[in-house]
């Protein structure tokens, strides 16, 4: 029985060349989180946080992705191509798989509002 909910930072915007924190939070379940996957809009894996093995950043993103804070992910040196959907996938037992969605908009302008509010997708 999947009782949990994923809260995410929702729709966020950040400045080109800057950095942004992607955050998800799993609540309302006692399930054990064994792994969290971070994926990009085209389904490519950015990073994995395994409960035993720790963080694994995929080679293509090693220069621009930093683990944390917590189970979150920090994207650095943002480009316009980083605009799009990001997904956090929580692998848990005994519940199974929970997935949260974040939409990131990278702005050209020198002033970009960084929204950090949490919302349930």
């Amino acid at each position: 029985m999947m009782t949990g909910t994923i809260e995410t930072t929702g729709n966020i915007s950040a400045k080109k060349g800057g950095s942004v924190i992607l955050q998800c939070h799993l609540s309302s379940t006692m399930a054990q989180v064994t792994q969290v996957n971070w994926e990009q809009h085209d389904h490519s894996l950015l990073a994995i946080r395994n409960a035993e093995l720790g963080w694994h950043i995929y080679p293509a993103f090693k220069d621009r992705v930093a683990p944390g804070p917590g189970l979150g992910l920090t994207l650095q040196s943002l480009t316009m191509n980083d605009t799009g959907e990001y997904f956090c996938t929580y692998h848990t037992y005994p519940d199974g798989t929970y997935r949260g969605r974040i939409f990131l908009e990278v702005l050209e302008s020198s002033v970009a509002e960084h929204s950090a509010r949490f919302q349930i997708p």
Partner: antibody, heavy 119, light 107 residues
């Protein structure tokens, strides 16, 4: 080349015990979670148990909880399934399988080892 | 547990044809369905996971679609080596459960 080789199957009486082994090669065994899946004589597949990469977390289907124990020895690149209080419905081909690094499926399977529970 | 109904259980087709195999879950499993191929004397092969993602090394003649409760495996331009047993499996929640299988045979 990734390879999984199961052994230890055989004929056992109801109530008996058996220990299956799965020898892994061709990949870094200690990085992957592993599962046991069985296939009944009627060809139905059933997930049996899973163990995390380091062995800290173990999960079981309700049908085997309390009777089966999954374990691993990363130094020996070997996965185990200890089965006790065996029943006729445990008769099946037992496969070990590797869970994908992203945890989404089972990407490599062994050829299986046959377990028959009969008096 | 999530129950998976796979259909048809038996399918006869000719080389060159395109076929579809369906799996239906009794409750939503999001996109989390995998497809496997089973052949005598060979180890089971992962074809598709997360509904539509092609496993590395699998030819693009295999494709998966679906979301929620209804999923489809499509195999185009059937070749002799494609005639085998196919299983779907949900990986959304524990226990992971499988469909009953589809035996694809040469007509």
């Amino acid at each position: 080349e990734e390879q999984l080789v199961e052994s230890g199957g055989g004929l056992v009486k109801p109530g008996g015990t058996l220990k299956l082994s799965c020898a892994a090669s061709g990949f870094t065994f200690s990085t992957y979670a592993m599962s046991w899946v069985r296939q009944s004589p009627e060809k139905r597949l059933e997930w049996v148990a899973e163990i995390s990469s380091g062995g800290s977390y173990t999960y079981y289907s309700d049908t085997v909880t309390g009777r089966f124990t999954i374990s691993r020895d990363n130094a020996k690149n070997t996965l185990y399934l200890e089965m006790s209080s065996l029943r006729s419905e445990d008769t099946a081909m037992y496969y070990c399988a590797r869970k994908t690094l992203d945890y989404y499926a089972l990407d490599y399977w062994g050829h299986g080892t046959s377990v028959t529970v009969s008096s | 547990d999530v129950q998976i109904t796979q259909s048809p259980s038996y399918l006869a087709a000719s080389p060159g044809e395109t076929i579809t195999i369906n799996c239906r879950a009794n409750k939503t499993i999001s996109k989390y369905l995998a497809w496997y191929q089973e052949k005598p004397g060979k180890t089971n092969k992962l074809l598709i996971y997360s509904g539509s993602r092609l496993q590395s090394g699998i030819p693009s003649k295999f494709s998966g679609s679906g979301y929620g409760t209804d999923f489809t495996l499509t195999i185009s331009s059937l070749e002799p080596e494609d005639f085998a047993m196919y299983y779907c499996q949900q990986h959304n929640e524990y226990p992971w459960t499988f469909g009953g299988g589809t035996k694809l045979e040469i007509k």
